[in-house]
Amino acid sequence: PGPPPGPPRVSPDPRAELDSTVLLTRSLLADTRQLAAQLRDKFPADGDHNLDSLPTLAMSAGALGALQLPGVLTRLRADLLSYLRHVQWLRRAGGSSLKTLEPELGTLQARLDRLLRRLQLLMSRLALPQPPPDPPAPPLAPPSSAWGGIRAAHAILGGLHLTLDWAVRGLLLLKTRL
């Protein structure tokens, strides 16, 4: 007969998993804040910039109290997938001006990807229903000009910063309910 079966696999403490997700999110938040500041120094923003293809902010800070874990993680994952796509697009189509933000933009993309994988893992460990596969998103049109790429970068980093700030608050609040 084969080797004796190993001990039953104990699922890690979900609070520890959530802690690890909070740490990654907070680290990415600080990176994003710094990169957005770097962008403002290199290319000062003339007012607020928006990009229609970006997700709307998931939740105001005041509404955090009503959050439920499955909803938060599902929405956060969807929003971060959108931001990952936008960062990839920015690096590919943003133009030569934005090359000055490398390698930081590449590091941001890698950490965003890592956070998404961590969220996926957390959802499976918590036995949450897995979201359906993402429908293929329509391709993002290249910026109309170099300045268009810079405006897009301001919008993407600003939106990502707000989303991650919301995520840290939400995840910490949810941790108290586990």
Epitope: S27, A30, A37
Partner: antibody, heavy 120, light 108 residues
Framework: EVQLVESGGGLVQPGGSLRLSCAAS????????MHWVRQAPGKGLEWVAY????????YYADTVKGRFTISRDNAKNSLYLQMNSLRAEDTAVYYC?????????????WGQGTLVTVSS | EIVLTQSPATLSLSPGERATLSCSVS???????LHWYQQKPGQAPRLLIY???NLASGIPARFSGSGSGTDFTLTISSLEPEDFAVYYC?????????FGQGTKLEIK
């Protein structure tokens, strides 16, 4: 050798104003974010304000927001702190500090400090 | 705001002994944003350890840092007379950047 030298401290009445300066040398000033940190007599350290290399992002502690203004002149290798509406609790030694090489590596270089006393 | 609480407030030890200083953080923070400083009377603070465990330039190897999440430690393996000072931890992940209240390391 990195050097930071603060000046401009002194005795000022409550409600008054003061402008601190920090002269930087020994490094490319325009490449680094800069901070002001203060220390009340016999107390601990308190972060006051931060400015990015190009001055386009600025952060303040809540205790000074709306009263203090951080600025810099890269051509003069100088950092400033304009302090208005001063209160007794602003009495402290004020240090300028430079981040290490990356923003997440702490305050690696400090000046010797300049004492601000707010008293009537 | 993230609050850092240092313990003990005062630590009385003799030269040659091992010192262990603690910094407890109110929120989870990534270790790369936790730093330690030393300050002697009448002097500016000096960066000792950055990113929780990296020795700053010119700092002797008897100093070391460790920890993660909410609990961080500064260790001095064998105290030298010049190590008696006040030690501060500081977080740089969130604005406002904050310091602990300090631990005074005094000669027993």
């Amino acid at each position: 050798e990195v050097q930071l030298v603060e000046s401009g401290g002194g005795l000022v009445q409550p409600g008054g104003s003061l402008r601190l300066s920090c002269a930087a040398s020994g490094f490319t000033f325009s490449s680094f974010g800069m901070h002001w940190v203060r220390q009340a007599p016999g107390k601990g350290l308190e972060w006051v304000a931060y400015i990015t290399p190009g001055s386009n992002t600025i952060y303040y502690a809540d205790t000074v927001k709306g009263r203090f203004t951080i600025s810099r002149d890269n051509a003069k290798n100088s950092l400033y702190l304009q302090m208005n509406s001063l209160r007794a609790e602003d009495t402290a030694v004020y240090y300028c500090a430079r981040e290490y090489y990356s923003y997440d590596e702490g305050f690696a270089y400090w000046g010797q400090g300049t004492l601000v006393t707010v008293s009537s | 705001e993230i609050v850092l609480t240092q313990s003990p407030a005062t630590l009385s030890l003799s030269p040659g002994e091992r010192a262990t200083l603690s910094c407890s953080v109110s929120d989870l923070i990534p270790s790369q944003y936790l730093h330690w400083y030393q300050q002697k009377p009448g002097q500016a603070p000096r960066l000792l350890i950055y990113r929780a465990s990296n020795l700053a330039s010119g700092i002797p190897a008897r100093f070391s840092g460790s920890g993660s999440g909410t609990d961080f430690t500064l260790t001095i393996s064998s105290l030298e007379p010049e190590d008696f000072a006040v030690y501060y931890c500081q977080q740089g992940v969130d604005v406002p950047f904050t310091f602990g209240q300090g631990t005074k390391l005094e000669i027993k």
